[in-house]
Interface confidence: medium
């Protein structure tokens, strides 16, 4: 063996943001010829020795961080990056507004504000774009999201979520969409790969390989992916927190 077994990838299809009661599939992908996969939910004793986990209806208890690895012979691979599986629709949707308004001149400034009546300390802003279900979207954990020196690339549809740092994988429903229009430019907006399309039940037979049920905190199967900055913290954008522990 010339090097360590490369880490597998772990994906959530069609998205890692899953509305309650909607389906999602977790897929661990390693090189060809893998002897055994191990897919586990972190900070719990739940695991399965399969590459694919089909969740027919998202539950609060299934939200959290997942990781997988694989075995070839007696060797185990390095673990995959952690996957943050988020249940959305747990709380009422926040409101998203643009100050001074949703129409802004190219080169100007605009601030998107996500507001909620509840005591949430975390907010996530997404820009809708071309489907990119395997890529973590840009995320800022702040209530106000200033966009300085606006360009055509900022045009598009935005949504925000609110949640609590005490339960970082249980999110609100998405806000109503906000359409940001950049005027004074003829350049076609670039579509930034951000929020995946809303999950829908479009699983083929090949995708729905495993159905999950929990028995004694072990995945039993039937064949059939911190900084969590509060609104008062840094103005700089922070990526999604890979806190793979129960906060």
């Amino acid at each position: 063996q010339s090097g360590p077994l490369p880490k597998p990838s772990l994906q959530a299809l069609p998205s890692s943001l899953v509305p309650l009661e909607k389906p999602v599939t977790l897929r661990c992908q390693g090189p060809p010829g893998v002897d055994l996969y191990r897919l586990e939910k972190l900070s719990s004793s739940r695991y399965q020795d399969q590459a694919v986990l089909f969740i027919p209806a998202m539950k609060r208890s299934l939200a959290g961080r997942y990781r997988c690895s694989y075995q070839n012979g007696s060797l185990w691979s390095l673990p995959s990056d952690q996957l943050e599986l988020v249940a959305t629709g747990v709380f009422a949707k926040p409101s998203l507004s643009a100050q001074p308004g949703p129409a802004v001149s190219s080169g100007g400034d605009v601030t998107l504000q996500c507001q909620t009546r509840y005591g949430f300390d975390q907010f996530a802003l997404y820009k809708e774009g071309d489907p990119a279900p395997y890529k973590n979207p840009e995320r800022w954990y702040r209530a106000s999201f200033p966009i300085i020196t606006v360009t055509a690339a900022h045009s598009g549809t935005y949504r925000c979520y609110s949640f609590s740092s005490r339960d970082p994988y249980l999110w609100s429903a998405p806000s109503d969409p906000l359409e940001l229009v950049v005027t004074g430019t003829s350049v076609t907006p670039s579509r930034l790969p951000t929020e995946p399309p809303s999950p829908v039940a479009e699983f083929s037979e090949a995708t729905a390989e495993l159905t999950v049920s929990f028995t004694n905190e072990v995945f039993t199967t039937e064949t059939s992916r911190s900084i969590t900055a509060s609104p008062k913290e840094s103005d700089s954008p922070a990526g999604p927190a890979r806190q793979y522990y129960t906060k």
């Epitope: 360590p4 972190l42 004793s45 390095l78 990056d81 973590n136 999604p240």
Partner: antibody, heavy 114, light 106 residues
Framework: QVQLKESGPGLVAPSQSLSITCTVS????????VNWVRQPPGKGLEWLGM???????DYNSTLKSRLSISKDNSKSQVFLKMNSLQTDDTARYYC????????WGQGTSVTVSS | DIQMTQSPSSLSASLGGKVTITCKAS??????IAWYQHKPGKGPSLLIH???TLQPGIPSRFSGSGSGRDYSFSISNLEPEDIATYYC????????FGGGTKLEIK
């Protein structure tokens, strides 16, 4: 060939900030995370934090309020910033690749002294 | 946070002999433990990950075992170049090193 190399100021005054750069080669920062670890003189290794391939971060909970890790993928550089340094922050600082840290730099020595 | 208690803090053994180091986690770490060799003036070297998987190029006289909260690391047929400090690392929940074990040869 995977390589990591740390560069730092060497000497920092108490209450000031520390900035260290880790320059990597042989792998892409978009596909691998980078950790920061330190070793005070005569003591053991202490994990400081990590930046993942997608730019997200994790920090040692006891140091989280003073730490910031960022990166520039195009320059293959990862940056550690630590605020409000005290003499017990004197240590050798290492960067290391991903989990569970399969490649390490040689480290850079940082002394906090007036 | 998970704590890792490593013992002994130092040990001395004869060439050709065998030594065992243990690490106990404050909670179940599901085999996510790695072992490192650290020599002065160098960065640490990964020897074993996921409890027992040897890194490429690491001789088989290095071994690891364990599950749950209790893990061990052994070196058999000790050689002079094994003089170093050895650390365990849990990476189940953030990352935590053990306190280290300084190995000396009699």
């Amino acid at each position: 060939q995977v390589q990591l190399k740390e560069s730092g100021p060497g000497l920092v005054a108490p209450s000031q900030s520390l900035s260290i750069t880790c320059t990597v080669s042989g792998f892409s920062l978009t596909g691998y995370g980078v950790n920061w670890v330190r070793q005070p003189p005569g003591k053991g290794l202490e994990w400081l934090g990590m930046i993942w391939g997608d730019g997200s971060t994790d920090y040692n909970s006891t140091l989280k309020s003073r730490l910031s890790i960022s990166k520039d993928n195009s320059k293959s550089q990862v940056f550690l910033k630590m605020n409000s340094l005290q003499t017990d922050d004197t240590a050798r600082y290492y960067c290391a690749r991903d989990l569970p840290m399969d490649y390490w730099g040689q480290g850079t020595s940082v002394t906090v002294s007036s | 946070d998970i704590q890792m208690t490593q013992s002994p803090s130092s040990l001395s053994a004869s060439l050709g002999g065998k030594v065992t180091i243990t690490c106990k986690a404050s909670q179940d770490i599901n085999k996510y433990i790695a072992w490192y060799q650290h020599k002065p003036g160098k960065g640490p070297s990964l020897l074993i990950h996921y409890t027992s998987t040897l890194q490429p190029g690491i001789p088989s006289r290095f071994s690891g075992s364990g599950s749950g909260r209790d893990y061990s690391f052994s070196i058999s047929n000790l050689e002079p170049e094994d003089i170093a400090t050895y650390y365990c690392l849990q990476y189940a929940n953030l990352l935590t090193f053990g306190g280290g074990t300084k190995l000396e040869i009699k």
